[in-house]
């Protein structure tokens, strides 16, 4: 089948990095500068991606493969193939329509990207709060007060009146 196809279609013999030039009697011509073809038998070469502005070139375009971009420091990639660059925030913040904003009380973000997430509710698992939550860190849950027999642990469980995850900000 391949042999028959190549007899019928001379373009199938054109390797990656070339295109089948109809203007030159279907001979294989190299891709022009700033273009590429990643597969054989192409009738055109694709324009290379340009990494502009906040996009940095991670891998240069070649005649057989597209350029790859990443983001300049202070930004991070979003989407397939780094199709977007999003500004970093600090830990304890999230990016909103009005910029980087501190996490609301009861939520945290331990990364420079993404959204603030609620603290873990230790009491749902029948546990107590071992370490209070902050804007940057989730609470740490410890064993339930009932599990702590005298002398078994040096950790003092929080006062009963305190809500799970409470932390003075």
């Amino acid at each position: 089948f391949e042999r028959t196809r190549s007899l019928q279609d001379p373009c199938s013999n054109c390797p990656a990095g070339t295109f089948c030039d109809n203007n030159r009697n279907q001979i294989c011509s190299p891709c022009p500068p700033n273009s590429f073809s990643s597969a054989g038998g192409q009738r055109t070469c694709d324009i290379c991606r340009q990494c502009k502005g906040v996009f940095r070139t991670r891998k240069e375009c070649s005649s057989t493969s597209n350029a790859e971009c990443d983001c300049t420091p202070g930004f991070h990639c979003l989407g397939a193939g780094c199709s977007m660059c999003e500004q970093d925030c600090k830990q304890g913040q999230e990016l909103t329509k009005k910029g980087c904003k501190d996490c609301c009380f009861g939520t945290f973000n331990d990364q420079k990207r993404g959204i603030c997430r609620p603290w873990t509710n230790c009491s749902l698992d029948g546990k107590s709060v071992l370490v209070n939550g902050t804007k940057e860190r989730d609470v740490v849950c410890g064993p339930s007060p009932a599990d702590l027999s005298p002398g078994a642990s040096s950790v003092t469980p929080p006062a009963p009146a305190r809500e799970p995850g409470h932390s003075p900000q």
């Epitope: 991606r49 979003l78 660059c85 329509k97």
Partner: nanobody, 122 residues
Framework: EVQLLESGGGLVQPGGSLRLSCAAS????????MSWARQTPGKGFEWVSG???????YYTESVKDRFTISRDNSKNTVYLQMNSLKPEDTAVYYC????????????????WGQGTQVTVSS
């Protein structure tokens, strides 16, 4: 071909003002959101301000109440009026299309100008 051409940069004393312009061509400017970014050797790129096609404006915290973004669709131009300039505003300022409409986010299909240098120094 899309072109964005910034102008209006220069040397200014602290507390002074500058007005940057960005002349756009090669696309439907009136229906496009536009943005300004800046790049400093120390801090890298920073999203500064954006304006939707309808005129809604957004600013990064550090320039709020000092910078004003505006647009003139009849002239295909977006402006950045910069008042009460500080030495930390020293940077190369870039105009860019803003297809994501999301604060601090640009996409690979956005177009960028060549930039104009702003230096704030006494």
């Amino acid at each position: 071909e899309v072109q964005l051409l910034e102008s209006g940069g220069g040397l200014v004393q602290p507390g002074g003002s500058l007005r940057l312009s960005c002349a756009a061509s090669g696309f439907t400017f009136s229906s496009s959101a536009m943005s300004w970014a800046r790049q400093t050797p120390g801090k890298g790129f920073e999203w500064v301000s954006g304006i939707y096609s309808g005129g809604s404006t957004y600013y990064t915290e550090s320039v709020k109440d000092r910078f004003t973004i505006s647009r003139d669709n009849s002239k295909n131009t977006v402006y950045l009026q910069m008042n009460s300039l500080k030495p930390e505003d020293t940077a190369v300022y870039y105009c860019a299309t803003w297809g994501t409409l999301r604060f601090g986010v640009w996409a690979e299909y956005d177009h960028w100008g060549q930039g104009t240098q702003v230096t704030v120094s006494s």
